[in-house]
Every structure is written in C-alpha cells, then in structure tokens.
C-alpha cells in the first residue's frame, strides 16, 4: 500500500489561522493512523480519521505548532510514515503610521512606522516613503530569535515644508518568507500629509487712523496667515490686562466714538495648532476747531492784480476774526466777516502789500492763528530775442534775450536754448536794493552751422516764487533759425568743349552751392582785368562762335552770405584752308640740282605743317623750316611722292606732288618705286 501527506514536505501557517494536514493511503481498506511530532512534543491539534484518510487540524495555529509532524499508517503488518514541516508566521495587520505631534511647517516631527504582531521578526523589512522619496528603510535580520509576537518600528525625523502638503506618506512592511502568497508578505499604509502652519504675520490695518476725534468712526481689519486659515478674534485690554471679547470677525468697526473708547485693541489669529496676536492703540481726542486760510499758505500776486484772502473757522459755530500783518504795518485791504468766514481784499497790489498776513480766530476763549505770505511779482511780457546780424554758417553771431519789467529780479532765471541744447543760463541772484521793476538781459555768442536750420532759438525766462511754490512762472520766446551758407563749390561745365572750331555752338553752364541758393552772374574778363556782365542765367550760350569770342569767362555765385567765383577760357579755332604745296624750280629736275619744296596755309597762322616723303618702308617726316624743305643736291633716290599736311585742333588738309630726278649720263628719268 502507499501513503501520501498533503501538503507535501513543507507548509506555512499564520498564527491564529486554522491549518489542516491530511494523511491518506491507497491500497489498504482499513488502515490505522497515528500522528506525532518529530520531537514527541504535544500535537496541539485535533485528529479526525475517516476510512483511508486522517486529518490533523490546528485551530488556532500557535507557536506550539511549529514542528515537523509525522503521520504513521499501519496496514496489517505493513507500516508507512510520512513527515511534513509546519512553519509559522504572523503578519496580521497593515503597518501603522504615528506622528510625534501635528506636522507644522518648519518644526521637526518624528514619524514612526509600526509593524504589529510580527513573527519571525528577523525576516521583517520596513520602508518609509514621502511621495517618491525614500526616507528610510530597515531590515531586522540581526534581531534575536524569540518565539513571540513583536511590534517593530522604523523612525524618521523630518522638518515639514509647504510642498509636503498633500503628499502621501507610505509605510511598507515586508515579511521575507518564501511560501507566503505575495499578496500577504507585503503590507502598506498610506497617509496623506496634513501639514499645518501656526498663525503668524498677524497684522492690523486701521482706517482712517489710530488717532481719532470724538464722534468719529474707525474700521480695523485683522489678517493672520496659517494653515488651516486662522479664525480671528477681537478683544480690548482692560485695566487688569484681561481681554474683553468684542468680535469674532476679521473686521471690527467702532462708530460714534467717545474719549473713553481710547485703549489697546487686540486681534488674535487662532487655528488648531497655535495662536498669534497683534495689538493697536486707539487714541480718541476731543474735537478741536481748525483755522483754514485760502488760497494757501503762500499767494503770488502780479503787480496791479487784486487778491482775496479767506479765513475759515471749521468746527466752531460763532468765531470772531481779526487780521494783521506780521510787521504790524497798516492793512491796505478791506475786511468782510460772514459767519464762519472772513475775507481780506487787497485791490491793485503793489510792493507795499508784500507781507505775511495773519488771521486770528477766537472760539470759546481759545484763539488760533493762521498765516499766509503774499508775494508780489511782475512778469508781464514774453522775452525779446535780438541778433547782431543774419545767421551765416561758421560766422559768430551775438544773441541777446531781454526780459522787461521784472520783479523780484533776484528770483529770475533766463535760459537760452538752441534746439534742446542750452547755450547759456543765468540766475540773477545779485542783491536787490529798492523794490522796482527792472529789465534784465542775457547775452551770448555762438557760431551757427547749417545743421541749426530748422532748429529754434528759445529764450526761457522763469520767475521763481517762494519756497512753497513748486512750479515757477515761465515765459518764453521762440525764433526759428535759418542759417545762410556763402556760395561755394562754384562749377562750370562747357559743352561740347572749351576749344572749338569757328562757327560751332557752345554752352557754358554754371552752378554754385549755398543757402539761400546763389544767384548766377556771367561776365567776360576784359584785357584790363575788369569784368563785363553778360547774363544772369545759369547757362551762357553762343549759337555760332567767332574767332574773337575767344577769352576768359567768369561765373559768380552770389547770395547774402558772400560770393564765389570760377572762370573758364574759351578758345575758338579756325580749320586750315587754301593749302599750297609747291616745288622750285620744277617737278622734274636733274641729278645735282637744288630743289625747294614749300607748303603754306593762308588762313591759319597757328598751324602745324608736316612734310613727308612716301616710301615703301614707311613715311619719312622731313625737317622743314616754316613749311620749306631744301634738297641741296638732288639724287636719283630723292625722286618720289611728297606730302604736306596742315593741322589744327579742329581740322587738317592734305596736298601731295611727285618729284622726278633725271640721271646725268643717259638722261633717263628715275622714278621712285611707288
């Protein structure tokens, strides 16, 4: 017969669970079963046998069940035995996460991860994560082996930050036992981090002010930062430092205040983990009356103008008014009182009205005084700009700016600007003698350039008032600049050429640069050097030139700024005519004769005359004197063709003749080979 045990060889059971071992036989009708432990300790289990099967049940599994169990089956005289080892473990719960206190930003906290009722502890491992970050991990393999359930923990201290809000804290416990189902050997607990911020930066804003008048109202708003958002409580400190609770809102409004409402008000921000307070002191004062003087503490009045000073009592039902000057000089004005107002009218102010005026208001035996300074000035006209002459590029010019009838001139500033550039600035700070109207002048010299055209010359006069007035009185004059440029780069173009043949047309064109555009004047220079005016056109035209049109022609560019002059010489030439080529004594001579070849041109004295003898090897120029060439003793080789060319710049004429030379012996003619 055969014996089998199930599960085979080895099994694992969790403490507190139930576990069944089954022993069965085949090939035996009525076997006898017996169970024992390898070391013969108590079974700590129940046995139930039915036919060929015996079941050993451990319920609940405990440390006493960690053994090798043996099943013995007897069939007749046969006996068979099988063993199975039972390992036990305990891993019943998910780990627990504990904190040493609430998680407060910036304050270290210890987090503890506990794995409860573990067996065997040496097989335990714990990981602790914050989000994706491993904070710590520990294995407990060095722990003593004891047959008991133990709770093991892993601790980490960290300082929470704002970014930790909402992060998950994960505690993962693993029990490294082969046979446990993977779902059982790893347990984890996840806790979302609840991070707190104790109330801080508690601040109070008070509107309109902490110093108040009787009957007034105040609104105080308190804010406090924290997580969760702090609740706000308002209280008032009593004499014994006890707080009198006033409100549970962020805003506390007090109306119709009395002097006894003065005191220290406390605002407190409170949340789950802390509190933070701020204090403010309110001072409620008795309501005073106020004296107001208008137009202001300083009044600027132009000579001849009228000034109205108004004094008002605010917060007083029946005031009495009085006016005086600081120096107690007589008042030149008219006073009019109307209820809570009094006016002093100064008509047509002059230098004698320049004072500090004081208005005194009496209300229920209390007198308040307010002053205003009346400053007299004169600044009636815009400045006047004058220049020493027209503006010419590169030529210095003097500009003066005159400001008439000014008072007080020791407050005067004159500035002269060219475009955006200050040419000169002057403060007239010299001591004033008697009070009078004065005319002040600012003078400067500058060199205009062409770039200044289009810019403006600005004379700016500022009359600065007393310290109180921020903006000075200002007047200005503007003069656009137009800079002249003396004519320059005067140029003459001659078309077609300054050397011409008699009868040809010619154009002489002149241009000149300058501002304003120069006027053109054509003249002819006479022999005595004087100029004979010809034309005011830019172009001087000769339809048909004559020989006596030759000469020097002068073009002048003229404008307000100067003159520029340029000249050109015109040469009129005559083309050669009536050219004559003669031979003496005759065209046919004997060997040894003297021969004279002459070339003359009747109409042109200044001409080039070239005498040539034609030859196979090329023309040979003959040395002629005044167009004549003499052959002293004619040779046979002197025979040939002679050519005369008369040339000027405008043309040329050509004549030729043939000279024969006869030999002495046989009277034969000798002709050149041409």
């Amino acid at each position: 017969f055969k014996i089998e045990i199930s599960p085979e060889y080895k099994t694992i059971a969790q403490i507190g669970d139930s576990m069944a071992l089954t022993c069965s036989t085949t090939g035996c009708e009525s076997p006898l079963f017996s169970w024992r432990t390898q070391i013969d300790s108590p079974l700590n289990a129940k046995v139930r046998t039915e036919g060929s099967k015996s079941v050993l049940t451990m319920e609940p599994v405990s440390f006493e069940n960690e053994h090798s169990y043996l099943c013995t089956a007897t069939c007749g005289s046969g006996k068979l035995e099988r063993s199975i080892h039972v390992d036990i473990y305990s891993f019943p719960k998910d780990p627990e996460i504990q904190f040493s206190g609430p998680l407060e930003v910036g304050k270290p906290v210890t987090v503890k991860c506990l794995a409860p009722d573990i067996y065997p502890v040496y097989r335990l491992e714990i990981d602790l994560f914050k989000g994706d970050q491993l904070m710590n991990r520990q294995e407990f393999s060095s722990e003593e082996m004891t047959k008991s359930l133990e709770t093991k923990s892993l601790e980490v201290t960290f300082t929470p930050v704002i970014e930790d809000i909402g992060k998950a804290l994960v505690c993962r416990a693993k029990l490294h036992i082969d046979q446990i189902d993977s779902t059982l050997k790893e347990r984890e607990t996840v806790k979302e981090l609840q991070v707190y911020i104790s109330p801080r930066n508690t601040t109070i804003s008070v509107h309109p002010s902490t110093r108040l008048q009787e009957g007034g109202a105040v609104t105080m708003t308190c804010s406090s930062e924290g997580l969760p958002a702090p609740e706000i409580f308002w209280g008032r400190k009593l004499d014994n430092e006890v707080l009198q609770l006033l409100s549970g809102n962020a805003t506390l409004t007090l109306i119709a205040m009395r002097m006894e409402d003065s005191g220290v008000y406390v605002c407190e921000g409170v949340n789950l983990i802390g509190r933070d307070k701020a204090e403010v002191e309110l001072v409620v004062q008795e309501k005073p009356f106020i004296v107001d003087i208008s137009p202001g503490s300083q009044v600027a009045a132009q000579v001849g103008d009228s000034v109205v000073l108004t004094c008002a009592a605010i917060g007083c039902d029946s005031p009495s008014f009085s006016w005086r000057t600081q120096t107690d000089s007589p008042l030149n004005g008219v006073v009019r009182n109307e209820g809570a107002k009094s006016t002093l009218v100064l008509s047509s102010v002059g230098f004698e009205d320049e004072h500090s005026y004081l208005c005194a208001v009496t209300c229920l035996q209390r007198t308040l005084e307010k002053r205003t300074q009346v400053e007299v000035y004169s600044f009636p006209e815009d400045p006047v700009i004058k220049m020493s002459g027209p503006l010419v590029h590169g030529r210095p010019v003097t500009v003066n700016c005159t400001v008439p009838n000014v008072y007080p001139f020791d407050h005067l500033e004159i500035e002269l600007l060219k475009g955006e550039t200050t040419l000169m600035k002057k403060y007239f700070l010299e001591e004033m003698g008697i009070k009078s109207l004065e005319t002040k002048i600012l003078e400067t010299t500058f060199i205009p350039t062409i770039e200044d055209t289009g810019k403006s010359l600005v004379c700016l006069a500022r009359l600065h008032s007393g310290e109180m007035e921020s903006e000075p009185k200002q007047r200005q004059s503007v003069q656009p600049l137009y800079v002249n440029v003396a004519p320059k780069e005067t140029t003459i173009w001659v078309s077609p050429s300054p050397i011409l043949e008699e009868g040809s047309p010619v154009n002489l064109t002149c241009s000149s640069d300058g501002i304003p555009a120069p006027k053109i004047l054509w003249s002819r220079q006479l022999n005595n050097g004087e100029l004979q005016p010809l034309s005011e056109n830019t172009t001087l035209t000769f339809m048909s030139t004559k020989r006596d049109d030759s000469g020097i022609y002068v073009c002048e560019g003229i404008n307000e700024a100067g003159i520029s002059r340029k000249s050109v010489e015109l040469i009129i030439q005559v083309s050669p005519k009536d050219i004559q080529l003669t031979v003496f004594p005759s065209k046919s001579v004997k060997e040894g004769d003297t021969v004279i070849i002459s070339c003359t041109c009747g109409n042109v004295p200044e001409t080039w005359i070239i005498l040539k003898k034609k030859a196979k090897t090329g023309d040979m120029v003959l040395k002629s004197v005044d167009g004549s060439y003499t052959i002293r003793q004619a040779q046979l080789q002197d025979a040939g063709i002679y050519e005369c060319e008369s040339k000027t710049e405008v043309g040329s004429q050509l004549r030729s003749l043939t000279l024969d030379v006869k030999g002495k012996e046989h009277n034969k003619d000798y002709f050149s080979p041409e």
Partner: antibody, heavy 118, light 107 residues
Framework: QVQLQESGGGLMQPGRSLNLSCVAS????????MTWIRQAPGKGLEWVAS????????YYPDSVKGRFTISRDNAKSTLYLQMNSLRSDDTATYYC???????????WGQGTLVTVSS | DIQMTQRPASLSASLGETVSIECLAS??????LAWYQQKPGKSPQLLIN???SLQDGVPSRFSGSGSGTQYSLKISGMQPEDEGVYYC?????????FGGGTKLELK
C-alpha cells in the same frame, strides 16, 4: 564555523563585465541577508549591494545602481555580484559579508581584488 | 545620506595608554552604530554593535559609548595587536554609511 570565500576578481578593462562569487558555509545560508562591501586601495569601506533571504529584495547605492546586480543561489549557498560597464573607480577589494544593510556586518570573507584599468 | 566623520584621522599610542576615537553622525542615529577593526592586509572585524555591545571574543579593553550624533570607541590599555584602522558605521538610516577610518599605531 562561519566561512565566506570570495572569487572571480582580476584585471579588467573599463567597460567590461565581471562576475564575483562568494561561497558560504558554517551557517544556514537562506536565513540571512547578504551584502557586498568594497574598499578602494588605501581608502575606506563602501557599501555596494544587499540581498534579502530569497533574493526578492536587492538594494544598491547610486554609484553602482544600474551597473551591478546582486543575486544568490540558496541551494548552492552562493552569493554573486555581476558587475557591468566597469569603471576605473570600481577598482577595489570586494568583501562578501553576512548581514543586511541595517545589520552590523559580523562575518567577512578575505576579499577579492578587482582592478579596472586600460 | 548620513555623513559619518571620524576623529582623529590617525594617532599613535604607547603601550598601555588609553585611546579614544570619536565618530560624529550628521544626524541622530539612535545608537545604531558598529565599530570595526581592520588589521593590515586583513578583512575588517566587528568589535562593537548597538554603540556599546561588545562582540563575543573581543577583549574587554574595548568599549563603546555615546548617543544621538556623538559616539566613541575607547581602548583602555593599548596593546601591539590593536594596531590597525578602525571604522564606525551607522545602520540607522538607509543607506548604510561608514566613517573615513582612524589609523592607530603603536608608539
């Protein structure tokens, strides 16, 4: 008594691979975490890798993560360290120790020298 | 990672002299500290674990103490066989880290 015997060290070129072994005896091998620790010449000790009882959990420092693999064969009572993409700064004596990353290292092998040089 | 700093880096002691080696952790390690001795050319040997528990077979002249971030190893009466390098190691926070070592020589 507990004995740990490393082998497999030697001279290797950078970028190459090497496998170290450690044969354990004198204790029930599968009842302990095992760890490799190294010591560069003339330098201190550095933890290299740890493996749990069955090999289910393995841990490494950033310096070797992704290049080294620790494993074990409980049937052969042998611990391994597969070292890939070797670098010159991996030159060290490699010790096989009994114990996990949180435990004191009570038993050490005699060490095997790995030299990485071109 | 927790930094472990050992002081001094090296020291010489006369025979019978009492020697102290300090180990400083960059944060609290709750006594999870071990001390090792490494003799020239040998493997390290565990002397003390849990900051103060002496391993079996380790002479009683060796003792460990400390808490929080400060720990020390004391040798009460230096012997020739105590020459070597001593290392501390924390196992409190992953990953495990060692001190740089203290070289102890006999004067």
């Amino acid at each position: 008594q507990v004995q740990l015997q490393e082998s497999g060290g030697g001279l290797m070129q950078p970028g190459r691979s090497l496998n170290l072994s450690c044969v354990a005896s004198g204790f029930t091998f599968n009842n302990y975490w095992m760890t490799w620790i190294r010591q560069a010449p003339g330098k201190g000790l550095e933890w290299v890798a740890s493996v749990s009882f069955t090999g289910g959990s393995t841990y490494y420092p950033d310096s070797v993560k992704g290049r080294f693999t620790i494993s074990r064969d409980n049937a052969k009572s042998t611990l391994y360290l597969q070292m890939n993409s070797l670098r010159s700064d991996d030159t060290a004596t490699y010790y096989c120790t009994r114990g996990g990353y949180s435990s004191p290292f009570a038993y050490w092998g005699q060490g095997t020298l790995v030299t990485v040089s071109s | 990672d927790i930094q472990m700093t050992q002081r001094p880096a090296s020291l010489s002691a006369s025979l019978g002299e009492t020697v102290s080696i300090e180990c400083l952790a960059s944060e609290d390690i709750s006594n999870s500290l071990a001390w090792y001795q490494q003799k020239p050319g040998k493997s390290p040997q565990l002397l003390i674990n849990g900051a103060s528990s002496l391993q079996d077979g380790v002479p009683s002249r060796f003792s460990g103490s400390g808490s929080g971030t400060q720990y020390s190893l004391k040798i009460s009466g230096m012997q020739p066989e105590d020459e070597g390098v001593y290392y501390c190691q924390q196992g409190y926070k992953y990953p495990p880290t060692f001190g740089g070592g203290t070289k102890l020589e006999l004067k």
